[in-house]
């Protein structure tokens, strides 16, 4: 039994780091491996992933952190039975893969405006909680073509935009995703997506109802 | 062996500043999120706020906001608080404690005393 | 605030014999990773704070196993089975889950 590809991990920066790998042939990971990781640190215990199949020959592993500091450094032990496969180390915070944010809602009730929430995905005591920065998706369900990306930099988890940028009388999807530059981390998983049915009164109708009114005067 | 130890006692009149130190051994802080507890005279423990040495990152209880700041020194394996506008309620002890993911850890304390 | 409420606050027990302290949470100290960080601390006279109980049921390394914890949610216990006189000073239990942390008021045990 042998390692085809070596371990590689991701970290949320709070408390799950996901490692990945293959084996040389089909494998029951939960029966045949275990992965051991400590922290390097006073008091640090070993702790024991029980590793689950990601396809015939995958295994993935979900490594429980209580905390995560910027310095952190885990050493990696791969076991099957009483032979060691391989031995390795992560840095959570050179391999941070955020959070996705949750809770978007878009609120339809402010005149003309499109008003896009969604919760921060981090406590106020993580690092990453005023670091993030997100991307929503828009996307029409009638046209394919009609799909846009906004991009928001600032802090606030919220998004608004003018109903009239999207159109009228159909119904639209959005979702979101976080990625954090001071860690330069890859992008979350979209967040679930959300539906409403955008409904507007088009400045042409309106236009056309005003100059119609003033033909009558 | 592991130990932290702080700045000795200090006395300062109502309105001015009082910066204490507390320097790490046997550890690195960059390891750990380094926090400060306050305890006045005969009174229980309050938690005052707390850095991760290696980004700087800060976070206060809400009661000392403003007038509290937690720094460190990763060069000296150093924790400094600072509080400013004293008062007479600030005499206490201060604890700086390292904690990873808990008060394993706690300095001696430092007396300040506010008094005019 | 997360406010923790301790009971008793002074405790007066016969060497060799059982004590309990109570602590109850405000709202819910479970964290979003999953982790209650509820901690026990004794303080003893004339010196800093040292750690009992982490993440509820955890002994610190060193410490004797006469004291344990339990609870859940918003309701938390330490227990000594039997007292010993090395055992007086003030305990302090402690929510690390929700900034702003907090202490308990603590409560105070002496020996009989």
């Known amino acids: 039994m042998k390692v085809l590809q070596e371990p590689t991990c991701v970290s949320d920066y709070m408390s799950i780091s996901t490692c990945e790998w293959k084996m040389n042939g089909p494998t029951n990971c939960s029966t045949e491996l275990r992965l051991l990781y400590q922290l390097v640190f006073l008091l640090s215990e070993a702790h024991t992933c029980i590793p689950e199949n990601n396809g015939g020959a995958g295994c993935v592993c979900h490594l429980l952190m209580d905390d995560v500091v910027s310095a952190d450094n885990y050493t990696l032990d791969l076991w099957a039975g009483q032979q060691l496969l391989w031995k390795g180390s992560f840095k959570p915070s050179e391999h941070v893969k955020p959070r996705a944010p949750g809770n978007l809602t878009v609120h339809t009730n402010v005149s003309d405006t499109l008003l896009l929430t969604w919760s921060n995905p981090y406590p106020p005591d993580n690092y990453l909680y005023n670091h993030l920065t997100y991307a929503v998706n828009i996307w029409s369900e009638n046209d394919p073509a009609d799909f846009r990306i906004y991009n928001v930099t600032y802090l606030e988890p919220s998004l608004r935009i003018a109903a009239s940028t999207l159109k009228s009388g159909i119904s639209y999807r959005a979702r979101v995703r976080a990625w954090a530059q001071c860690y330069n981390t890859t992008w979350s998983e979209w967040s679930p997506s959300t539906k409403w049915h955008n409904s507007y009164r088009e400045p042409f109708e309106q236009h056309h109802h005003h100059h119609h009114h003033h033909h009558h005067h | 062996e592991v130990q932290l130890v702080q700045s000795g006692a200090e006395v300062k009149k109502p309105g001015a500043t009082v910066k204490i130190s507390c320097k790490a051994s046997?550890?690195?802080?960059?390891?750990?999120?380094m926090h400060w507890v306050k305890q006045a005279p005969g009174k229980g423990l309050e938690w005052v706020g707390r850095?991760?040495?290696?980004?700087?990152?800060?976070i206060y209880a809400s009661k000392f906001q403003g007038r509290v700041t937690i720094t460190a020194d990763t060069s000296t394996n150093t924790a400094y608080m600072e509080l400013s506008s004293l008062r007479s309620e600030d005499t206490a002890v201060y604890h700086c404690?390292?904690?990873?993911?808990?008060?394993?850890?706690w300095g001696q304390g430092t007396l300040v005393t506010v008094s005019s | 605030d997360i406010v923790m409420t301790q009971t008793p606050l002074s405790l007066s027990v016969t060497p060799g014999q059982p004590a309990s302290i109570s602590c109850r949470s405000s709202?819910?100290?479970?964290?979003?990773?999953?982790?209650?960080?509820l901690e026990w601390y004794l303080q003893k006279p004339g010196q800093s704070p040292q750690l009992l109980i982490y993440?509820?049921?955890n002994r610190f390394s060193g410490v004797p196993d006469r004291f344990s914890g339990s609870g859940s949610g918003t309701d938390f216990t330490l227990k000594i089975s039997r007292v010993e006189a090395e055992d007086v000073g003030v305990y302090y239990c402690?929510?690390?889950?929700?900034?702003?942390?907090?202490f308990g008021q603590g409560t105070k045990l002496e020996i009989k």
């Open positions: 404690v390292s904690r990873r993911p808990w008060f394993a850890y």
């Open positions: 046997g550890f690195n802080i960059k390891d750990t999120y």
């Open positions: 850095i991760d040495p290696t980004n700087g990152y800060t």
């Open positions: 709202q819910s100290i479970v964290h979003s990773n999953g982790n209650t960080y």
């Open positions: 993440k509820v049921t």
């Open positions: 402690f929510q690390g889950s929700h900034v702003p942390y907090t």
